[in-house]
């Protein structure tokens, strides 16, 4: 056969669907690889062909669109399963072609089993809610296109294993779940089960997402440098190890890049000749506020090093701060027989 533009296996789109539920999978060609949509392609006389490779097999085979009750069907650029079966797992390929043009892409589809509490190997999206911030809501994801707007589905929400009536300041409102006030106790997995009729059959869609309650922008502050501070003086003798921690607290800020760095005499440690090492550790609070610690270490400090300026810097979307460490050379303790005796005028 003639050459086909093969985009390979698109592992970025690892599609996971639940067993025994409807699934609609759009051909990724039109979404991510080609500059035209299905309608344009169809109008130009191009045909969309589907085939698949079963799990642990190498053989590409056509998809059987003649199963009872049209269990698998194609509609425009969508491959439909009504419903899926566990052995539908495999790599699926959609190919767009005519006599002069060909383009194809493969993607993995995994049919996943869930238990009665909706636990499964499914990768869950995370939705962040601001703590004590007023009404916020989550929406049952990825249910568009499964039923027409004339169909009124029933939606049941669960937190973990339990059906949500109205509890813990949560109000179910159809496809939305409204949080009157988000608290740490609202952290967890939330599942919506959408039930709808189609051609005399009843289908269920199960969607689970993780809610994480995070710090509110109302409470966000610029970075706070806890160390170095004015109360601690790093007093060292030449030859000793100098260790200065820079500990910075960052309020949680959505999509903020938190940075901590040291300067020595106004330069980044990489730009000077001193043998400096910097180790960083990061910890998070329950609301994802962040504490970063960067420990500046000079194994054998020289008297020259003890005269330098060591400044810790921090930056977030809320602002930039800096604090100098108090570093000084330790004055050697007087040797009594010489210094002290001389002081008393002994000869």
């Amino acid at each position: 056969s003639e050459r086909c533009d093969d985009w390979g296996l698109d592992t970025m789109r690892q599609i996971q669907v639940f067993e025994d539920e409807p699934a609609r999978i759009k051909c990724p060609l039109f979404e991510h690889f080609l500059k035209f949509n299905y309608s344009t392609a169809h109008s130009a006389g191009l045909t969309l062909i589907w085939y698949w490779t079963r799990q642990d097999r190498d053989l590409e085979e056509p998809i059987n669109f003649r199963l009872p009750e049209n269990r698998i069907s194609k509609e425009k650029d969508v491959l439909w399963f009504r419903p899926t079966l566990l052995n539908d797992t495999g790599n699926y390929t959609c190919m767009l072609r005519n006599t002069t043009y060909c383009s194809k892409v493969a993607f993995p589809l995994e049919v996943v089993q869930k238990d009665s509490c909706f636990n499964s190997p499914m990768k869950l999206p995370v939705h962040k809610l601001y703590i004590e911030y007023g009404i916020q809501r989550i929406t049952c994801p990825n249910v568009d296109g499964y039923f027409p707007s004339s169909v009124k589905p029933t939606i049941t929400w669960y937190m973990g294993c339990y059906k949500i009536q109205n509890f813990n300041n949560v109000i179910p409102e159809g496809m939305n779940l409204s949080f009157l006030i988000a608290l740490i106790s609202n952290n967890g997995n939330y599942t919506c089960v959408v039930t709808y009729p189609e051609n005399g059959r009843t289908f269920h869609l199960t969607r689970t997402l993780t809610v994480k309650v995070v710090g509110s922008p109302k409470n966000a502050v610029p970075p706070v440098i806890h160390s170095p501070n004015d109360h601690v003086v790093y007093e060292k003798e030449p030859g000793e190890e100098l260790l200065i921690p820079c500990t910075v607290y960052f309020s949680f800020l959505m999509d903020s890049r938190n940075e901590v760095w040291w300067t020595i005499d106004g330069k980044k440690p990489d730009d000077i000749t001193i043998d400096v090492t910097i180790n960083e550790s990061i910890s998070h609070s329950r609301t994802e506020d962040e504490t970063r610690t960067q420990i500046l270490s000079i194994k054998k400090v020289t008297s020259e090093d003890l005269k330098r300026s060591y400044v810790c810097h921090a930056r977030s979307a809320k602002g930039e701060v800096a604090k100098a460490a108090k570093v000084k050379q330790k004055v050697p303790a007087p040797r009594y027989t010489v210094e002290l005796a001389c002081g008393f005028g002994a000869t």
């Epitope: 813990n168 300041n169 109000i171």
Partner: antibody, heavy 126, light 111 residues
């Protein structure tokens, strides 16, 4: 488990137009700090019920108000006293009503206003 | 804003009969609706919450149904003690606001 209301005295609160009054609602037989909201509802003489607002009675103290309140009324709570209060300001004759407080248990249902206080009559007149 | 419309008012029925009160929401409130009974000189009393759940201590003669925008309170085997005004309460959230709205009330007269 009940709510006791105070404010304006047993004979009810008589206030001049433009005046202010604080109504309070004390929990008896349960602690407000547990996880409850206190909601306030008023009823003008011979008329229906009108929602004023709700306050989360624990340390968070979040509040929601009906749009018509327009900042004239303020909800507060005193955790130690297990009390929720409603401050009424810039009162007019149209604010003459029986003012009720009611508990909402969000672990139960947010439309379940239960129990209710006995109500305090507020009369605004010169 | 959410508006709750109650019909009819007043409504009358004989002892032992059945009364149906309707409540219509101006927008979808799903199942977030309660029914209250109020007698003269008393505070309201919760009968039904979440559209159809009977509150503790309320006789099973009271039942609620509906979801979305149309709701019904039914009182069967009517007793003289059921003479009162009945209110529905709808709950709806919007962006950062809560909207609780009562219906105008329906007076039930027992003959």
């Amino acid at each position: 488990q009940q709510l006791e209301q105070s404010g304006g005295g047993a004979e009810g609160g008589l206030v001049k137009p433009g005046g202010s009054l604080e109504l309070c609602c004390k929990a008896s037989g349960f602690s407000l700090t547990t996880n409850y909201w206190i909601c306030w509802v008023r009823q003008a003489p011979g008329k229906g019920l009108e929602w004023i607002g709700c306050i989360y009675a624990n340390s968070v103290g979040s509040t929601y108000y009906a749009s018509w309140v327009n900042g004239r009324f303020t909800l507060s709570r005193d955790i130690d006293q297990s009390t929720g209060c409603l401050q009424l300001n810039s009162l007019t004759a149209a604010d003459t009503a029986m003012y009720y407080c009611a508990r909402v248990d969000p672990g139960y249902s947010f439309d379940a206003f239960d129990p209710w206080g006995p109500g305090t009559l507020v009369t605004v007149s010169s | 804003a959410l508006v709750m419309t109650q019909t009819p008012s007043p409504v009358s029925a004989a002892v032992g009969g059945t009364v149906t009160i309707n409540c219509q929401a101006s927008e979808d409130i799903y199942s977030n609706l309660a029914w209250f009974q109020q007698k003269p000189g008393q505070p309201p009393k919760l009968l039904i919450y979440r559209a159809s759940t009977l509150a503790s201590g309320v006789p099973s003669r009271f039942s609620g149904s509906g979801s979305g925008t149309e709701f019904t309170l039914t009182i069967s085997a009517l007793q003289s003690d059921d003479a009162a005004t009945y209110y529905c309460l709808g709950v709806r959230t919007y962006f950062n606001t809560l909207n609780n709205s009562f219906g105008g009330g329906t007076e039930v007269v027992v003959k």
